[in-house]
């Protein structure tokens, strides 16, 4: 399938609009600090060059790889050294090392200003004035803040973003129409970014085998009627797509994702009965729909797993002949029977099975040795079930905000060295598991909760990797992808932690808190809570509750005062002093 000119091939496959959008995303994900105008200029230059190659694939430089072309273009940026420091050293390398170097410098937490939403009329004017620039700016701002965002999916978000403005800027009440749509896109976008970040971490930190195992389990749950060979083909293709996107090969990734969607729709009879509606949609919607499609019904007459994987005398023979294929079949068979299990639980079971076979197939009596392997699964299954039951009860008792606070205290005590903004962000997201999953019936709770927690804990892992401060976080993040959540759950209070020096400035608040949204006000309070725990890790729940209740009352009182600033100054000093006394600081 070799093409004389890779850039011409991708331009023709994707079309000019998608080509330009994907190159912009790729550049913004690599050079996250560059101004919008600079990126647009680079994209236009690459696009003009691609067009010359479409016209004549033998033209000069058209035979170069996309990494060479894009890397050369990025390395023309004049301010590379002063803006990016050592990333400029990447430009001295040859491909493929140069691209690897750029990838290593992607920043999960770039020092960029928070995106502030302008007034609706201002946005609508900008949209009408120059729709193309407005949408490009959206791609640019999201891509540079989320350097692993799944690029073809970002095109889908941009399409919905455009549709929202097209509809709402003509509406009688523009704000009532537009703002809920933008909120939904923002929340879905953050979730999509975090899910993709886990896929990339899985590939980059744990390798292709780990990703393929995840994909086998998930696709077998989703398509339980599909044959193992069919699932294996989908897993291979999906792995290629995500390897490309995570590696910065966005044009190839988008092209291959489109091919995969086409294949799935052409073969839906042998894959799933749930794909019909998805397959009637246009390309971007179709790919998104397939990725989110509900699990198909399980075949009615599935035999017991024990026959092939425990009772058969050929277990060790089958395992020895093709270990990964046999384990893949085990995972496929187990997962298609258990849509009620999380993917990570299924992977733990498969790992336990593998470990048992490794040990037993070398024993004097293998069958006797592995006969009870399924009994070892019971505690592995019960652990997440019990954890979810307890936490859903706590969530129902406390509500989301106070449940988040309970998790903030729990995680700050486990890993107090982690930065306060990271602890707040991660604990708030962990706390959202309640509203997201606890409403589901038992059969859907575990896949919802534990797989969501895997995504959130990966955020902690990637943020911590940038500036490592805790050996315990490093250990839980790097030892086993599927055991991250149990590893964090098992952490107790860090007894080695030396409490932070008390700093009254951390607990000094001003009248500006009164104009914040409820969410931002919560974040301020939760930041204070983390700092309190860092000062007094042995504080009891009751002590912390007393301080937080008073803090809430203090903010409420001062926001109603005539002279708000004086109230915050005076009452704030008293609150600090009273809190110090109550906590014995």
């Amino acid at each position: 399938d070799a093409h004389k000119s890779e850039v011409a091939h991708r331009f023709k496959d994707l079309g000019e609009e998608n080509f330009k959008a994907l190159v912009l995303i790729a550049f913004a994900q690599y050079l996250q600090q560059c101004p919008f105008e600079d990126h647009v200029k680079l994209v236009n230059e690459v696009t003009e060059f691609a067009k010359t190659c479409v016209a004549d694939e033998s033209a000069e430089n058209c035979d170069k790889s996309l990494h060479t072309l894009f890397g050369d273009k990025l390395c023309t940026v004049a301010t590379l050294r002063e803006t990016y420091g050592e990333m400029a050293d990447c430009c001295a390398k040859q491909e493929p090392e140069r691209n690897e170097c750029f990838l290593q410098h992607k920043d999960d937490n770039p020092n960029l200003p928070r995106l502030v939403r302008p007034e609706v009329d201002v946005m609508c004017t900008a949209f009408h004035d120059n729709e193309e620039t407005f949408l490009k700016k959206y791609l640019y701002e999201i891509a540079r803040r989320h350097p692993y965002f799944y690029a073809p999916e970002l095109l889908f978000f941009a399409k919905r973003y455009k549709a929202a403005f097209t509809e709402c800027c003509q509406a009688a009440d523009k704000a009532a129409c537009l703002l809920p749509k933008l909120d939904e896109l923002r929340d879905e976008g953050k979730a999509s970014s975090a899910k993709q970040r886990l896929k990339c971490a899985s590939l980059q930190k744990f390798g292709e085998r780990a990703f393929k195992a995840w994909a086998v389990a998930r696709l077998s749950q989703r398509f339980p009627k599909a044959e193992f060979a069919e699932v294996s083909k989908l897993v291979t293709d999906l792995t290629k797509v995500h390897t490309e996107c995570c590696h910065g090969d966005l044009l190839e990734c988008a092209d291959d994702r489109a091919d995969l969607a086409k294949y799935i729709c052409e073969n839906q009879d042998s894959i799933s009965s749930k794909l019909k509606e998805c397959c009637e949609k246009p390309l971007l919607e179709k790919s998104h729909c397939i990725a989110e499609v509900e699990n198909d019904e399980m075949p009615a007459d599935l035999p017991s797993l024990a026959a092939d994987f425990v009772e058969s005398k050929d277990v060790c023979k089958n395992y020895a002949e093709a270990k990964d294929v046999f384990l893949g079949m085990f995972l496929y068979e187990y997962a298609r029977r258990h849509p009620d299990y999380s993917v990570v639980l299924l992977l733990r079971l498969a790992k336990t099975y593998e470990t048992t076979l490794e040990k037993c197939c070398a024993a004097a009596d293998p069958h006797e040795c592995y006969a009870k392997v399924f009994d070892e699964f019971k505690p592995l299954v019960e652990e997440p079930q019990n954890l979810i039951k307890q936490n859903c009860e706590l969530f129902e008792q406390l509500g989301e905000y106070k449940f988040q606070n309970a998790l903030l205290v729990r995680y700050t005590k486990k890993v107090p060295q982690v930065s306060t903004p990271t602890l707040v962000e991660v604990s708030r997201n962990l706390g959202k598991v309640g509203s997201k999953c606890c409403k589901h019936p038992e059969a859907k709770r575990m896949p919802c909760a534990e797989d969501y927690l895997s995504v959130v804990l990966n955020q902690l892992c990637v943020l911590h990797e940038k500036t490592p401060v805790s050996d315990r976080v490093t250990k839980c993040c790097t030892e086993s992808l599927v055991n991250r959540r149990p590893c964090f759950s098992a952490l107790e209070v860090d007894e080695t932690y030396v409490p932070k020096e008390f700093n009254a400035e951390t607990f000094t608040f001003h009248a500006d808190i009164c104009t914040l949204s409820e969410k931002e006000r919560q974040i301020k309070k939760q930041t204070a809570l983390v700092e309190l725990v860092k000062h007094k890790p042995k504080a009891t729940k009751e002590q912390l509750k007393a301080v937080m209740d008073d803090f809430a009352a203090f903010v409420e009182k001062c926001c109603k005062a005539d002279d708000k600033e004086t109230c915050f100054a005076e009452e704030g000093k008293k609150l600090v002093a009273a809190s110090q006394a109550a906590l014995g600081l």
Partner: nanobody, 118 residues
Framework: QVQLVESGGGLVQAGKSLRLSCTAS????????TGWHRQAPGKQRELVAT???????NYFESVKGRFTISRDNAKNTVYLQMNSLKPEDTGVYYC????????????WGQGTQVTVSS
């Protein structure tokens, strides 16, 4: 209930010292804090120093290095030693006992006048 009575105020020349006392009747719990506030003519009341039952001290505003807060638990009394007084230290000094939750546990004395002449 807690009653607070301040004493020790008066007229004094700039550069001189005064010692204010605040005696509590009724019990302040171990998590309690006693603070001295002052209110200069035409200004808002401001907290200048606090001391907890456990002896934890905070100083605020422009009094650091000149004012010292201390307590005698046996006498249920908190003192504010004011040295190097300045005309801008003039005002009514109030004693305040408080602890969490503040909205329920906030007790005040009626104040003692301090006037510093230049």
């Amino acid at each position: 209930q807690v009653q607070l009575v301040e004493s020790g105020g008066g007229l004094v020349q700039a550069g001189k010292s005064l010692r204010l006392s605040c005696t509590a009747s009724g019990s302040i719990p171990s998590i309690g804090v006693t603070g001295w506030h002052r209110q200069a003519p035409g200004k808002q009341r401001e907290l200048v120093a606090t001391i907890s039952q456990g002896g934890h001290i905070n100083y605020f505003e422009s009094v650091k290095g000149r004012f010292t807060i201390s307590r005698d638990n046996a006498k249920n009394t908190v003192y504010l030693q004011m040295n190097s007084l300045k005309p801008e230290d003039t005002g009514v000094y109030y004693c305040n006992a408080f602890w969490l939750p503040l909205r329920l546990n906030d007790y005040w004395g009626q104040g003692t006048q301090v006037t510093v002449s230049s």
